[in-house]
């Protein structure tokens, strides 16, 4: 058994039928020795007296709030989690296997530039009585600061009968050198805890490894005199890291038909320019990604031909 | 410690392309050292990363962009001196900060070249005949290290006589590679930068 | 005392279905995945399926996939396993397993797929 | 299809020291605890060792297991007839974790 905050604390749980459980000794937060009475939850029902109360733990029904009372006055309140371990593992059972970039993903995270701000992502189909709270650091075994907000809500979906639910939370890295060469990786690590189940999940990282670019930006399309071509021009993200000629961008730009079935025609390159023919009813995307550390490619940014 | 903004002549920089040859060199060899040692622990999650200039070279600090040198987290410098007369220096107005910028690059290559090259003698007496070194990738480091023209004391291959731990070894290609390669982005940025100004 | 029994085993052409089952006593069966497995006669064990505790997530082995079905009754305590377009490699015992460093198994059931 | 490899057969006379060994990776032993069963002719396998190493109540101290690295081994200290049986480990990988990973079992005969 520890103590996650105050008052609050995680009982782990060997999870198999007819396990023996844990035992656990809760001690009543006062200075008062006699007249000692126990409670769980919203229930009158005495479960003990006396300044300690041992019970075993075994299932979801021995946890929830414990209670010791003086003479109908609340002395002191236990919340006990359940943090189950089911054959060596511990249970994710309140968020969902994102399955990319691999299996057993559950946190995603992606940087915009190498300023060491970061933000990370989690999916759920649970919609009440959930509550997550978030850490990171740069390394463990001599953490260096990082600092996150609170995760909020950040979309819901439908997905066949189930609505999903996805959290965010945003994370800055206290002293963060753009150029830095990282040798120790960010961890991050997130607490959930759902009625009375606790679990958590970690995620551990280079910026370098995450960094996804904004989409280009004010592409404009140019049409040459007496030609098909035109020149498509844009600009690097204002998001993105400074100077640019140090932290350069390669594009891709691509000539896409109306149907999904038509040909692609792609050109890659390191200016922010090129000449391409621009077909009846084609549209025009450039996407870009990191020059010298091959990344994930940004969202398109796209203009139509006409 | 930082690089000026106005440096060598346009089109008077031949380190660049040397420099981006490099990174491509350098990433398809440790593509195929993840490939062939799949049985390892090879990939970046797996490894430990070290980084075999720390506390002899600065490349880092010493080739910091003009622009970073507000950022107060950049400037953990490590004071280190370097011998500084190269031929990437183009120009009359090459500053002493980019020439200890340079030189800190040659070094790290330097000891780089070193390490493969040790290292490389012992994959060759490996019985399974595993992994070798790219030729490519050492040429290229030796073409970079050419065009930057460095005098500096050739360090001596290290030899060793006890029996080598292939094991091991493979382990340690992994962990040089992965260095090396991030070494490699940020020669190939400063390079980038420096063509630029 | 934990108990599975198993029931539903037979003989059946292939191409044609069978739905096993697999029922529990003496603990929550809501609250523990539940496995099949396999073993086809004079050979191992072979992993067929998982259901997690609240029959939100379901895992199949590549052998069986979208052809078994897996599922659960957590109010009638029983466990089941959907099996159709059945070929002669699945004629094996089938065994359930709760999931757990400590696991109870069912008795078997043969399932001969023959013409 | 099986990952967890084992001798297919290894032999004893009673009160020999048998071992049975299950070569795995890094993905499967590597990063997760194993587990041995005994099935017994006819019958459904019974759990030996649970956590690489642990016994559960019941089954004789002569069964003992250990993990190193990326294989795993069960050891019959003083074999005895009743111990005839086949022997399978199970683990599983760290990508398709809940998927139970069999070995491809071995038969323990005891001689005389």
């Known amino acids: 058994i520890w103590e996650l905050k105050k008052d609050v604390y995680v009982v782990e749980l060997d999870w198999y039928p007819d396990a023996p459980g844990e035992m656990v000794v809760l001690t009543c937060d006062t200075p008062e020795e006699d007249g000692i009475t126990w409670t769980l939850d919203q229930s009158s029902e005495v479960l003990g007296s006396g300044k300690t109360l041992t019970i075993q733990v075994k299932e979801f029904g021995d946890a929830g709030q414990y209670t010791c009372h003086k003479g109908g006055e609340v002395l002191s309140h236990s919340l006990l989690l359940l943090h189950k371990k089911e054959d060596g593992i511990w249970s994710t059972d309140i968020l969902k296997d994102q399955k990319e970039p691999k299996n057993k993903t559950f946190l995603r995270c992606e940087a915009k530039n190498y300023s060491g701000r970061f933000t990370c992502w989690w999916l759920t189909t649970i919609s009440t009585d959930l509550t997550f709270s978030v850490k990171s650091s740069r390394g463990s075994s001599d953490p260096q600061g990082v600092t996150c907000g609170a995760a909020t809500l950040s979309a819901e979906r439908v997905r066949g009968d189930n609505k999903e639910y996805e959290y965010s939370v945003e994370c800055q890295e206290d002293s963060a050198c753009p150029a830095a060469e990282e040798s120790l990786p960010i961890e991050v690590m997130v607490d959930a805890v759902h009625k009375l189940k606790y679990e958590n999940y970690t995620s551990s990282f280079f910026i370098r490894d995450i960094i996804k670019p904004d989409p280009p930006k004010n592409l404009q399309l140019k049409p040459l005199k007496n030609s098909r071509q035109v020149e498509v021009s844009w600009e690097y993200p204002d998001t993105w890291s400074t100077p640019h000629s140090y932290f350069s961008l390669t594009f891709c730009v691509q000539v896409q038909g109306k149907s999904k079935r038509e040909k692609k025609d792609r050109v890659f390159t390191d200016k922010t320019s090129a000449t391409v023919i621009c077909r009846k009813n084609a549209s025009i995307s450039v996407r870009a990604q990191d020059r010298y550390y091959s990344s994930s490619w940004s969202e398109w940014a796209s203009v139509p031909c006409s | 410690r930082n690089l000026p903004v106005a440096t060598p002549d346009p089109g008077m920089f031949p380190c660049l392309h040397h420099s981006q040859n490099l990174l491509r060199a350098v990433s398809n060899m440790l593509q195929k050292a993840r490939q062939t040692l799949e049985f390892y622990p090879c990939t970046s999650e797996e490894i430990d990363h070290e980084d075999i200039t720390k506390d002899k070279t600065s490349t880092v600090e010493a080739c910091l962009p003009l622009e970073l040198t507000k950022n107060e987290s950049c400037l953990n410098s490590r004071e280190t001196s370097f011998i500084t007369n190269g031929s990437c220096l183009a120009s009359r107005k090459t500053s002493f900060m980019m020439a200890l910028c340079l030189s800190s690059i040659y070094e790290d290559l330097k000891m780089y070249q070193v390490e493969f090259k040790t290292m490389n003698a012992k994959l060759l007496m490996d019985p399974k005949r595993q992994i070798f070194l790219d030729q490519n990738m050492l040429a290229v480091i030796d073409e970079l290290m050419q065009a930057l023209n460095f005098n500096s004391e050739t360090v001596p291959q290290k030899s060793s006589l006890e029996e080598p731990d292939f094991y091991k070894t493979k382990i340690k290609l992994c962990i040089l590679l992965h260095a090396f390669r991030i070494r490699a982005v940020t020669i190939d940025r400063v390079m980038s930068y420096l063509n630029a100004s | 005392q934990v108990q599975l029994v198993q029931s539903g085993g037979g003989v059946v052409q292939p191409g044609r279905s069978l739905r096993l089952s697999c029922a529990a006593s003496?603990?929550?069966?809501?609250?523990?995945?539940m496995h099949w497995v396999r073993q086809a006669p004079g050979k191992g064990l072979e992993w067929v399926a998982f259901i997690r505790y609240d029959g939100s997530n379901k895992y199949y082995a590549d052998s069986v996939k979208g052809r078994f079905t897996i599922s659960r009754d957590n109010s009638k305590n029983t466990l089941y396993l959907q099996m159709k377009s059945l070929r002669a490699e699945d004629t094996a015992v089938y065994y359930c397993k709760t999931h757990g460093s400590h696991d109870n198994w069912g008795q078997g059931t043969m399932v001969t797929v023959s013409s | 299809s099986y990952v967890l490899t084992q001798p297919p057969s290894v032999s004893g006379t009673p009160g020999q020291r048998v071992t049975i060994s299950c070569s795995g990776g890094?993905?499967?032993?590597?990063?997760?605890?194993v587990k041995w069963y005994q099935q017994l002719p006819g019958t459904a396998p019974k759990l030996l060792i649970y956590c690489n190493d642990q016994r559960p109540s019941g089954v004789p101290d002569r069964f003992s297991g250990s993990k190193s690295g990326t294989s795993a081994s069960l050891a019959i200290t003083g074999v005895q007839a009743e111990d005839e049986a086949d022997y399978y480990c199970q683990s599983y990988d760290r990508g398709t974790h809940p998927a139970l990973l069999f070995g491809t079992g071995t038969k323990v005969t005891v001689l005389g």
């Open positions: 003496g603990f929550t069966f809501s609250s523990y995945g």
């Open positions: 890094r993905s499967n032993i590597g990063s997760n605890t």
